[in-house]
Each structure stands twice: as C-alpha cells, then as structure tokens.
C-alpha cells in the first residue's frame, strides 16, 4: 500500500523548504521536488519522505520533477530541471511551416 | 489551488465540548503535517497542536493536553480538533494550518456562561 | 508572555526600510529555521519568509529574512501603505516540542 508510511531504517535528509523545522529532518528516504505554478518562477524544495513512494517514480513534467534517494544527506547537492515545454511549431512530426 | 476550511466553532459554556474540522482540498493531504493554531481577541498567535502525515506522531501546548486531542481522517482529508472542559480563556479563533505555510481563514470558539 | 521576543510596534514612511526583530534561545531560532508571517486586519496569517531567508513565490522580494545565532529580523524595503499589518516570527522549539511564536509587530506605514 503505497498510503503507508515506511518504518524501515531511518536516513538524515537537507530540508530546505516551507515544512521543514530545521536544516536537516529524519525520513525513509530523501526526496528533491522542482515545482512550477502557473506564472511563477520554479521553487525547489529539499525534505524527507515517508509515504507515496509512488511519486518517486514519475517522469518529469513541465511543471513538476521529484526525485528521492536513499542515502545520508543524498538530497543535498541535487538540482533538478522541467521538462522542456516545445511551441507547437517545433514538435517533432511538424515541418513548421 | 490549496484550500482549508475550518467549520464546528460557536457558542459554548464552559466546561463543555466541541469538534473543530477542517476540510482540506487542492494539495495531498495525507503527505503534509497539519497543525491547530489559536488567536484570542486581540492577542497573538498560538500554536495549540500538531500531528503528522499519518497520524501517528501528535504534539501538544502543555496547557491544553489532556484536554484537547487533534486527529486526522486522510480518506476524508479532514483535521480534527476535539476540546474538552473548555474555559474562558479557550475563546479564539481557531485556525487550520498546513505545516508550515498555508492557513484557513479560522474558526470563532466562544466560551461564556 | 511569548517565547520569542518582538517589539510591540514598528512604524514608517512610505518608501523606507523598517526591520523587525525577533529573539528566541538556543532551542528555537538557535537551531532551527526562522518563518515569518503577516496578518492583514480581520485575515488569516499569509507566510512571508520561511528557512530564515527564503520566499516563497507570489511574496515580493521588498521583503528579506535573516538570521544570526538566536536571533533573526525580517526587513521591508520600499515601504507601501498595503504593509501596515501584523507581523509574527515563529520557530519550532526543541525543549518545548512544539511551535512557538513571538507575541507580534503592529507595523504602521505613516502618511
């Protein structure tokens, strides 16, 4: 059941976002999260993870790109990209004329 | 867009009982700590109490445990506040709080004889 | 009394700079992050600063964190009448095991 929160060994994790109380949290694994809202520049956020692992698996889109790692303060040092978005004139299979 | 919405404050007497809830929509509810955060007329913000993603782990202010207990339903994505033997001094507005950055726009607890 | 310390009021013009100051202990601001948040008149608090020095996006960059040892400050620069507000620091307390906030700065932008 991906609902339900790991109880595995714990890592220490850099937390660097709204929901962190200090520096460093403790979780099952470590997770990086670039999200983009409509109209505003990209924040990425640094934190520990302990359900959805699911999430840890999707592809990156244009507005949001999650990664997680296992080891001890493996979230520090990470930066991430969106999925570049292409103007309808240069997706492939269109000559662009 | 993320959303909290506080419901269940009125009019008590003292020593009495209520259930604050809070509906949460617009973000995964069940990946975010909550918390219950109260300001009395005029006064400053105080944090009352908080539980984590599973609710497996709560907190306490010393002066309301034992009397108040928080709780969560993540099927419902609902926050729950249930406070006991309430006094006077519980008068507040009581607000819903995403850990550590968004908030509901409260709820008013009167407590009068 | 709050565990964290902040002057009552602050006040200026507009178009300056005011900074408020917020001052804990070792097991609050001391060790971990500083968060601060503006309550307009008859509104719910709206988080302005969070890990000390960091906005959050939509929050103008007028406003600015900082932290040393246990004390921390928020800065408004270019000063607007739509500032005049409640200002709160908050930090998680280690011996307190819970939340702690300071008691609040009523910031006044005179005419």
């Known amino acids: 059941d991906p609902v339900k929160p790991s109880r595995g060994p714990l890592v220490t994790c850099t937390c660097e976002s709204p929901h962190c109380k200090g520096p460093t949290c403790r979780g099952a694994w470590c997770t990086v999260v670039l999200v983009r809202e409509e109209g505003r520049h990209p924040q990425e956020h640094r934190g520990c993870g302990n359900l959805h692992r699911e999430l840890c698996r999707g592809r990156p889109t244009e507005f949001v790109n999650h990664y997680c790692c296992d080891s001890h303060l493996c979230n520090h040092n990470v930066s991430l990209v969106l999925e570049a978005t292409q103007p309808p004139s240069e997706q492939p299979g269109t000559d662009g004329q | 867009e993320v959303q909290l919405l506080e419901s269940g404050g009125g009019l008590v007497q003292p020593g009495g009982s209520l259930r604050l809830s809070c509906a949460a929509s617009?973000?995964?509810?069940?990946?975010?700590?909550m918390s219950w955060v109260r300001q009395a007329p005029g006064k400053g913000l105080e944090w009352v109490a908080n539980?984590?993603?599973?609710?497996?782990?709560?907190n306490y202010v010393d002066s309301m445990r034992g009397r108040f207990t928080i709780s969560r339903d993540n099927s419902k994505n609902t926050l729950y506040l249930q406070m006991n033997s309430l006094r006077a001094e519980d008068t507040a507005v009581y607000y819903c709080a995403r850990e550590f950055d968004y908030w509901g726009q409260g709820t008013l607890v009167t407590v009068t004889s | 009394q709050s565990v964290l310390a902040q002057p009552p009021s602050a006040s200026g013009t507009p178009g300056q700079r005011v900074t408020i100051s917020c001052s804990g202990s070792?097991?609050?601001?001391?060790?971990?992050?500083v968060y601060w948040y503006q309550q307009l008149p008859g509104t719910a608090p709206k988080l302005l600063i969070y890990?000390?020095?960091k906005r959050p996006s939509g929050v103008p960059d007028r406003f600015s964190g900082s932290k040393s040892g246990t004390s921390a400050s928020l800065a408004i620069s270019g000063l607007r009448s739509e500032d005049e507000a409640d200002y709160y620091c908050a930090a998680w307390d280690d011996s307190l095991n819970g939340r702690v906030f300071g008691g609040g700065t009523k910031l006044t932008v005179l005419d």
């Open positions: 070792s097991s609050n601001i001391g060790s971990n992050y």
């Open positions: 890990g000390n020095n």
């Open positions: 617009g973000f995964t509810f069940s990946s975010y700590a």
């Open positions: 539980i984590n993603q599973d609710g497996s782990e709560k």
